[in-house]
Interface confidence: medium
């Protein structure tokens, strides 16, 4: 009883060796075919014929311009990629028989998707924006919003954004704030000069005025008569048949010459102006 | 409008010069990167320069560098490409172009022939 399955395993194993089972898988770098396990072929090389009980697999390099890069049983090699100039591209790297060409974009141009089947020109930042990570083969120009404090007023792929003038350093004054897309407008400090110089004008000139009043009224005599010095300005007056003459200017002068001395009241002054009017 | 108007164009020997001009009007032709691009017959449109703005920033062509030089004149408006050492490869008609995220605007071009 013991002897028959030791008698099945024998017959079992000749008549395995007679017929062998059909394999239901190959190993690596094998592709199964015809109930039979043949040899791929190898990166570089196309498949010519299957392999038979009496012949190994048949491979044929691939021709120029043609590529696998893999262990397999490829009738047809690939071509190489053509990096087409019309595109905006140019060959990084040559391909060989078991390697495709890469392709890069032209300097100024970047990679449409990681394949680099096209290339599209660098965008240029707007005004407004600045260049804060300039393009490269395979990535777009990153633009930034220009911060408070730096501007940039041009459409640029290479731009930076600038700082805005500083006024001070120029011993200037702002006149017009700047933004992100305008400089700062720096102009010379004659308002705030104008705000404490008129009134030191003011007071020195009414100071004056005072000491003026006060040696006349020390100088004059009770007999005086008032007409007098009310008449001695005429004699500076302009006639008006001058060509050209323009009495508006003396008294002008007068002024921002501080020396209002010859019109103490400004009488005539002000009859001028009317004359010529 | 906007116009841009290329000239300068010509025959030119292999090892020869030539300086092509650009003048541009109806745009703010100070705020813009410029660019040259270049046609070789039956090729397709090649980028040959660009600069910035305001000029301080140049780019070339690997094919071109060391030989052409680019530059602007924003008071005149216009755009300049000094093109040294020319070679046969270099014959195309060259057009000047406004650009920002595509070229938006064109020059109808001027004939670079170089030849002996």
């Known amino acids: 009883m013991v002897r028959l399955p030791l008698q099945c395993v024998l017959w079992g194993c000749l008549l395995t060796a007679v017929h062998p089972e059909p394999p239901t898988a190959c190993r690596e770098k094998q592709y199964l075919i015809n109930s039979q396990c043949c040899s791929l072929c190898q990166p570089g090389q196309k498949l010519v014929s299957d392999c038979t009980e009496f012949t190994e697999t048949e491979c044929l390099p691939c021709g120029e311009s043609e590529f696998l890069d893999t262990w397999n049983r490829e009738t047809h090699c690939h071509q190489h990629k053509y990096c087409d100039p019309n595109l905006g591209l140019r060959v990084q790297q040559k391909g060989t028989s078991e390697t495709d060409t890469i392709c890069t974009c032209e300097e100024g141009w970047h990679c449409t998707s990681e394949a680099c089947e096209s290339c599209v020109l660098h965008r240029s930042c707007s005004p407004g924006f600045g260049v804060k990570q300039i393009a490269t083969g395979v990535s777009d120009t990153i633009c930034e919003p220009c911060p408070v404090g730096f501007f940039s007023n041009v459409s640029s792929a290479f731009e930076k954004c600038h700082p805005w003038t500083s006024c001070e350093t120029k011993d200037l004054v702002v006149q017009q704030a700047g933004t992100n897309k305008t400089d700062v407008v720096c102009g010379p400090q004659d308002r705030l000069r104008a705000l404490v110089v008129i009134p030191i004008i003011f007071g020195i000139l009414f100071a004056i005025l005072l000491v003026l009043v006060f040696i006349k009224k020390v100088a004059k005599k009770p007999t005086n008569k008032a007409p007098h010095p009310k008449q001695e300005p005429q004699e500076i007056n302009f006639p008006d048949d001058l060509p050209g003459s323009n009495t508006a200017a003396p008294v002008q002068e007068t002024l921002h010459g501080c020396q209002p001395v010859t019109q103490e009241d400004g009488k005539e002054s002000r009859i001028s102006v009317q004359e010529r009017q | 409008e906007m116009q841009l108007l290329e000239s300068g164009g010509g025959l030119v020997q292999p090892g020869g010069s030539l300086r092509l001009s650009c003048a541009a009007s109806?745009?703010?032709?100070?705020?813009?990167?410029m660019y040259w691009v270049r046609q070789a017959p039956g090729k397709g449109l090649e980028w040959v320069s660009k600069?910035?703005?305001?000029?301080?920033?140049?780019y070339y062509a690997d094919s071109v560098k060391g030989r052409f030089t680019i530059s602007r004149d924003n008071s005149k408006n216009t755009l300049y490409l000094q093109m040294n050492s020319l070679r046969a490869e270099d014959t195309a008609v060259y057009y000047c172009?406004?650009?920002?995220?595509?070229?938006?605007?064109w020059g109808q071009g001027t004939l670079v022939t170089v030849s002996s």
């Open positions: 600069i910035s703005p305001n000029g301080w920033s140049t």
């Open positions: 172009a406004k650009y920002q995220t595509h070229f938006d605007y």
């Open positions: 109806g745009f703010t032709f100070a705020t813009y990167d």
